[in-house]
Interface confidence: low
C-alpha cells in the first residue's frame, strides 16, 4: 500500500513519542561519536518536518524516502569528516548506496568511554529535573554503544528504565530499590543486543534463506501445534521485521513488529495456547512477551517422520518440485518434535538431509541411497549432548569464575592472536553458559547452551571482523553459520603461534585494584591469565593454576597492607620472578 508521504505515514502509525525515540536511536546507531545535543537537534528538525507532512502530504520533500530524508539530515553534520573520517565519503553517494555505506561503517566496538553509573541521588535529581532528556539520554547511550540493538525492544527497555526511576526515586531506600533493577536491565540489555547482533549477522553475512531456516526451526519448536502454513506466514513476516531493523529502517521495523504482534494475538487459537497472557499486555510488553514465550505442548501422537521423508517413493519428486518448501516442511516437522534440540542442531540435520537428497536423487536407486539418512543424524545429535555433559560437569566442579578461567586458557591456546580484551570478554560470556544452562533438566540443556554459545561466538566473529588477526577465527566464522561452535570446539592448540615477548609491565599491578568491584577484579586477573598463556602457550593447567593462586594471594595480601602501593611494587616483582621461574619464561 503506497503512501504519498512515507514519513507522514510512519509518524501517524507510531505516534510522536515513538517516532522521535526511533529516529534518535537510528541516528545514534549511525553516528556513534556525535554529542547527545547534536542528535537531539537533528531529531527535532526531522520531527518538525514530519509534522508538516502529516498536515499536507503533498508539501515539498514529503514524498522522499526515509533513507533520503534521514541521510540528508545526517550529512548536514558539520564535523562529519574530522569525527568519522572516510564515513563522510558516504555523503557523496546516492540512495540506496549511501545507506549501505552508513551501515558498513557501524562499529561494534566504538571507542567510547565506559558508562559510569552516578550516585543514586544524582540520577534521581536528573530524572526529576527533566524526565524527557534523561530518558532520551538513555536511548542515545545504549544505541551508540550497540549499533544493532533491536530498536522496538530498546523502547521496551526505556519504558522499564523510566518505571524503575519513577518507583525508586520516591522509595525510602532509593539505592536498594533502584540498583538491582538497573543491574537487571544492564544484563538483559547486553544479552538482547548480542542476540539481535546474531540475527543481523545471519541476514547480512549468510542471507535471507539462512535467517528463514533459523526462524522456521525456532518458531516450530515454540508453536508445535501451529500448521505449516501458519509458521510460514510468521517466518515471512518476522524476516521482514528483522531485515528492516538490521538495515536501519527502524520506523518500518517497529511498525511491522506491532502489526505482527497484532496478527499473532488475533490468531492465537491457531498458533499457541501460551499466548493468552502476552496478548493482554500493552504493545511494547506484548511484543517482548511473545518473543520470549515458552514452547507450547507438542501435539499428541504425531506420526513418524520417516513416512513422508524417507519411506515415501515421492521424496525425490517432492524435493525436485519445491526444494526450499520441502526442506522447510522437513525442518518444521523435525523441530516441532524436538524442543530438546538446539536450533543450530536442527539446522545441521536439515543440511545433512538436503545434502543426502542432492546426492541420492541423482543416483540410480534414490530410495536405496537415502534410506538410512536418519542414521546419519545420530553422531550429529550426540556431539553437542556429550560436549554439554562434559562442560556442565566441569562447571559444577569449578564454579563460574574458575570455569571461565578454564575456557580462557582453552580459547587463548586455540586463537592466541586475538586481542586480550576480546578473549576475556568472549570467554567470560562463554563461561556464563554454566550458570545459565546447566541448572536445566536434560531436555532443556541443549537448546539453552548451544543456541547461547552461537550468540557469544558471533560476538567473537563481529569483533574479529573489525581487525582480523587469525585465519582460524575467520574460517570458523565464515564457512558455516550453524557449524561455528563445532568448528571452534574442534580447534586444537595453534602450533604456528610464536609466543609473545615477556613484558613485566603487563604483570605490574597497583593499589587501585583493591577498590574495584569483584567483577572488575576478576577481569584484571583474567586479563593476566590470558597474557600468561600468550607468553607460554604450552604451560600446563597445573602451572597456570599455581601462578594464578599465587597472584590471588598477592592481591589479597597487598590489599590488606597498610602501605598498599609499596606492597604491590615489591611483592609484585617477587611474583613476576616466581611466575617466570614456574613457567620457565
Amino acid at each position: 500500500d503506497a503512501h504519498k508521504s512515507e514519513v507522514a505515514h510512519r509518524f501517524k502509525d507510531l505516534g510522536e513519542e515513538n517516532f522521535k525515540a526511533l529516529v534518535l536511536i537510528a541516528f545514534a546507531q549511525y553516528l556513534q561519536q556525535c554529542p547527545f545535543e547534536d542528535h537531539v537537534k537533528l531529531v527535532n528538525e526531522v520531527t518538525e518536518f514530519a509534522k508538516t507532512c502529516v498536515a499536507d502530504e503533498s508539501a515539498e520533500n514529503c514524498d522522499k524516502s526515509l533513507h533520503t530524508l534521514f541521510g540528508d539530515k545526517l550529512c548536514t553534520v558539520a564535523t562529519l569528516r574530522e569525527t568519522y573520517g572516510e564515513m563522510a565519503d558516504c555523503c557523496a553517494k546516492q540512495e540506496p548506496e549511501r545507506n549501505e555505506c552508513f551501515l558498513q561503517h557501524k562499529d561494534d566496538n566504538p571507542n567510547l568511554p565506559r558508562l559510569v553509573r552516578p550516585e543514586v541521588d544524582v540520577m534521581c535529581t536528573a530524572f526529576h529535573d527533566n524526565e524527557e532528556t534523561f530518558l532520551k539520554k538513555y536511548l542515545y547511550e545504549i544505541a551508540r554503544r550497540h549499533p544493532y540493538f533491536y530498536a522496538p525492544e530498546l523502547l521496551f527497555f526505556a519504558k522499564r528504565y523510566k518505571a524503575a526511576f519513577t518507583e525508586c526515586c520516591q522509595a525510602a531506600d532509593k539505592a536498594a530499590c533502584l540498583l538491582p533493577k538497573l543491574d537487571e536491565l544492564r544484563d538483559e540489555g547486553k544479552a538482547s543486543s548480542a542476540k539481535q547482533r546474531l540475527k543481523c549477522a545471519s541476514l547480512q553475512k549468510f542471507g535471507e534463506r539462512a535467517f528463514k531456516a533459523w526462524a522456521v526451526a525456532r518458531l516450530s519448536q515454540r508453536f508445535p501445534k501451529a500448521e505449516f502454513a501458519e509458521v510460514s506466514k510468521l517466518v515471512t513476516d518476522l524476516t521482514k521485521v528483522h531485515t528492516e531493523c538490521c538495515h536501519g529502517d527502524l520506523l518500518e521495523c517497529a511498525d511491522d513488529r506491532a502489526d505482527l504482534a497484532k496478527y499473532i494475538c488475533e490468531n492465537q487459537d491457531s498458533i499457541s495456547s501460551k499466548l493468552k497472557e502476552c496478548c493482554e499486555k500493552p504493545l511494547l510488553e506484548k511484543s517482548h512477551c511473545i518473543a520470549e514465550v515458552e514452547n507450547d505442548e507438542m501435539p499428541a501422537d504425531l506420526p513418524s517422520l520417516a513416512a513422508d521423508f524417507v519411506e515415501s517413493k515421492d521424496v525425490c519428486k517432492n524435493y525436485a518440485e519445491a526444494k526450499d518448501v520441502f526442506l522447510g516442511m522437513f525442518l518444521y516437522e523435525y523441530a516441532r518434535r524436538h524442543p530438546d534440540y538446539s536450533v543450530v542442531l536442527l539446522l545441521r540435520l536439515a543440511k545433512t538431509y538436503e545434502t543426502t537428497l542432492e546426492k541420492c536423487c541423482a543416483a540410480a536407486d534414490p530410495h536405496e541411497c537415502y534410506a538410512k539418512v536418519f542414521d546419519e543424524f545420530k553422531p550429529l545429535v550426540e556431539e553437542p549432548q556429550n560436549l554439554i555433559k562434559q562442560n556442565c560437569e566441569l562447571f559444577e566442579q569449578l564454579g563460574e569464575y574458575k570455569f571461565q578461567n578454564a575456557l580462557l586458557v582453552r580459547y587463548t591456546k586455540k586463537v592466541p592472536q586475538v586481542s586480550t580484551p576480546t578473549l576475556v570478554e568472549v570467554s567470560r560470556n562463554l563461561g556464563k553458559v554454566g550458570s545459565k544452562c546447566c541448572k536445566h533438566p536434560e531436555a532443556k540443556r541443549m537448546p539453552c547452551a548451544e543456541d547461547y554459545l552461537s550468540v557469544v561466538l558471533n560476538q567473537l566473529c563481529v569483533l574479529h571482523e573489525k581487525t582480523p588477526v587469525s585465519d582460524r577465527v575467520t574460517k570458523c566464522c565464515t564457512e558455516s553459520l550453524v557449524n561455528r561452535r563445532p568448528c571452534f570446539s574442534a580447534l586444537e592448540v595453534d602450533e604456528t603461534y610464536v609466543p609473545k615477548e615477556f613484558n613485566a609491565e603487563t604483570f605490574t599491578f597497583h593499589a587501585d585494584i583493591c577498590t574495584l568491584s569483584e567483577k572488575e577484579r576478576q577481569i584484571k586477573k583474567q586479563t593476566a591469565l590470558v597474557e600468561l598463556v600468550k607468553h607460554k602457550p604450552k604451560a600446563t593447567k597445573e602451572q597456570l593454576k599455581a601462578v594464578m593462586d599465587d597472584f590471588a594471594a598477592f592481591v589479597e595480601k597487598c590489599c590488606k597492607a597498610d602501605d598498599k602501593e609499596t606492597c604491590f611494587a615489591e611483592e609484585g616483582k617477587k611474583l613476576v620472578a616466581a611466575s617466570q621461574a614456574a613457567l620457565g619464561l
Epitope: S270, L302, D308, S312, N318, Y319, E321, F326, M329
Partner: nanobody
C-alpha cells in the same frame, strides 16, 4: 504466501453425504502430502485422513474408515474429502492442512449433522 481455503460444509441429516474441497495456493501443492483435521465444539483437533503427494497412498482415522474418502487433483491444486453415512459425531469444523499437522492454519468449513 501459503493459503488453504476450505468449502463444501453445511447442515446435513444423519446418513447423508457431503463433499469438502480445499483450494491451495502459494506453494507447490503437488509436492506435499495433505491431511484433513476436524475440531468438534469444546474438543481438541482430531486427525481424520491423509494422502501422499501423488494421491496413491491414503490413510484414515478408525472413526471414519469405510465412510470417508480422501482424494486430490494436483492440476487444480485441490484436496477433497467425500463424506458418506454421516452421523452426529461427525459434527465439527473441518480443516485441510499440509503434511501431518493436526492444528488449523485456515478458517475451516463447518459440518453439522443433525435431524
Amino acid at each position: 504466501q501459503v493459503q488453504l481455503q476450505e468449502s463444501g460444509g453445511g447442515l446435513v441429516q444423519p446418513g447423508g453425504s457431503l463433499r469438502l474441497s480445499c483450494a491451495a495456493s502459494g506453494f507447490t501443492f503437488g509436492s506435499f502430502g495433505m491431511s484433513w483435521v476436524r475440531q468438534a465444539p469444546g474438543k481438541g483437533p482430531e486427525w481424520v485422513s491423509a494422502i501422499d503427494s501423488s494421491g496413491a497412498d491414503t490413510r484414515y482415522a478408525e472413526s471414519v474408515k469405510g465412510r470417508f474418502t480422501i482424494s486430490r487433483d494436483n492440476a487444480k491444486k485441490t484436496l477433497y474429502l467425500q463424506m458418506n453415512s454421516l452421523n452426529p459425531d461427525d459434527t465439527a469444523v473441518y480443516y485441510c492442512t499440509i503434511g501431518q499437522s493436526i492444528s488449523r492454519g485456515s478458517q475451516g468449513t463447518q459440518v453439522t449433522v443433525s435431524s
